[in-house]
């Protein structure tokens, strides 16, 4: 997070975050004094959740849209303190970072793997994703590979477009400082690849989660 | 009980369009990759195409590249191959195979086949 | 493509005899090679994957072994319902591709 500034925006929760933090000021109001095996608590929490039918979901899926209005009405005035550009604060209207051949293959072969062992984690449902694209050849990866280039592609192109309308007055400027930055952009954007698609990953297996229990 | 049944086999004309499907049973149909083979008659067996469980990619063999279209319909767990400007050499017994997918270090296996429908093209 | 070459193209054997089958491929294809067992008028069934593991339901006299170019279907002890023709299949590349067969026969 911001490095401890005060004046930054608490981050949005999830419907399932809001349920956590209910069930855990239930537990604290029936026993003031225990103290909470986490692990034990959290897995409590995710069966319970799983079992919740989408009414009973609903009012944490309501407080979770109301978080995420406040969460986005908060950042548009907030101003990160100087050098902080680390998790800056995503435009909702921005071109969506395209998904990795890696990431591709997982939406195919998720349901299964989480179909076939229902009691799996997230992190081993990701890791038995993870062998079993270690386990295809290199010729069955070709066309997440080929579809995962044709949307950076897009995205690229798509970014561009993005950055030049966000930035009418861009042009006058020097193509020598554009230059320049563009290095230190992709580095940023690199790392935030990565981020973006952790974040991908478990939102869409939280999607998961709440449409097998609509089924 | 797993199981594939092909039909829409027949005898159709050179340049002729034809159209397989596969019904599955017995298993999650959406969570395999899955695969047409054919056999002409006395011969060895041929991949034909094969497509993912989302539908989204599909991959063929040369030989019928431009001519053939796998699709599947996950919500009546039906596969189908529909096949246009049949050639001579196009006759043969058409299986519809489920595909195991990265199990191993092995890659893929066609673990369950249908019984086959016959297709000959002649005039 | 790559090719997969088999032989004997047919053998001919009695029951109870130890029978191999060897499957060649153009290139390597490290352990992801497959058996299949055909009858006559029936779909093929598979037998072995991944070069060495025994589908289940698969009678444990059936075997596999190899890696790279070189594989091998070993049957330990023949059975009168193993009179069929065998294929084996790469799944390194695509195509797919199989071996023109080895028709077992009783002798």
């Known amino acids: 997070m911001g490095k401890g500034d005060p004046k930054k925006p608490r981050g949005k929760m999830s419907s399932y975050a809001f349920f956590v933090q209910t069930c855990r000021e239930e537990h604290k109001k029936k026993h003031p004094d225990a103290s909470v095996n986490f692990s034990e608590f959290s897995k409590k929490c995710s069966e319970r959740w799983k079992t919740m039918s989408a009414k009973e979901k609903g009012k944490f899926e309501d407080m979770a849209k109301a978080d995420k209005a406040r969460y986005e009405r908060e950042m548009k005035t907030y101003i990160p303190p100087k050098g902080e550009t680390k998790k800056k604060f995503k435009d909702p209207n921005a071109p969506k970072r395209p998904p990795s051949a890696f990431f591709l293959f997982c939406s195919e072969y998720r349901p299964k793997i989480k179909g076939e062992h229902p009691g799996l984690s997230i992190g081993d449902v990701a890791k038995k994703l993870g062998e079993m694209w270690n386990n295809t050849a290199a010729d069955d990866k070709q066309p997440y590979e080929k579809k995962a280039a044709k949307l950076k592609e897009k995205y690229e192109k798509d970014i561009a477009a993005y950055r030049a309308k966000g930035k009418p007055d861009a042009a006058k400027k020097g193509v020598v400082k554009a230059e320049k930055s563009k290095k230190k952009k992709e580095e940023e954007d690199d790392e935030e690849d990565e981020e973006d698609e952790e974040e991908e990953e478990e939102e869409e297996d939280e999607d998961e989660e709440e449409d097998d229990d609509d089924e | 009980e797993v199981q594939l049944l092909e039909s829409g086999g027949g005898l159709v004309q050179p340049g002729g369009s034809l159209r397989l499907s596969c019904a599955a049973s017995?298993?999650?149909?959406?969570?395999?990759?899955m695969s047409w083979v054919r056999q002409a008659p006395g011969k060895g067996l041929e991949w034909v195409s094969r497509?993912?469980?989302?539908?989204?990619?599909?991959m063929y063999a040369d030989s019928v590249k431009g001519r053939f279209t796998i699709s599947r319909d996950n919500s009546k767990n039906t596969l189908y191959l529909q096949m246009n400007s049949l050639r001579a050499e196009d006759t043969a017994v058409y299986y519809c195979?489920?595909?195991?997918?990265?199990?191993?270090?092995?890659?893929?296996?066609?673990?369950?086949w249908g019984q086959g429908t016959m297709v000959t093209v002649s005039s | 493509d790559i090719q997969m070459t088999q032989s004997p193209s047919s053998l001919s054997a009695s029951v109870g005899d130890r029978v191999t089958i060897t499957c060649r491929a153009s290139?390597?294809?490290?352990?992801?090679l497959n058996w299949y067992q055909q009858k006559p008028g029936k779909a093929p069934k598979l037998l072995i994957y991944?070069?060495?593991s025994l589908q289940s339901g698969v009678p444990s006299r059936f075997s596999g072994s190899g890696s790279g170019t070189d594989f091998t279907l070993t049957i330990s002890s023949l059975q009168p319902e193993d009179f069929a023709t065998y294929y084996c299949?790469?799944?390194?590349?695509?195509?797919?591709?199989f071996g023109q067969g080895t028709k077992v026969e009783i002798k």
């Open positions: 497509i993912s469980p989302s539908g989204g990619y599909t």
């Open positions: 195979a489920r595909l195991e997918v990265g199990a191993t270090s092995g890659g893929t296996a066609f673990d369950i």
């Open positions: 299949q790469q799944s390194y590349s695509t195509p797919r591709t």
């Open positions: 991944a070069a060495s």
């Open positions: 017995g298993f999650t149909f959406s969570w395999y990759d």
């Open positions: 290139q390597s294809i490290s352990s992801y």
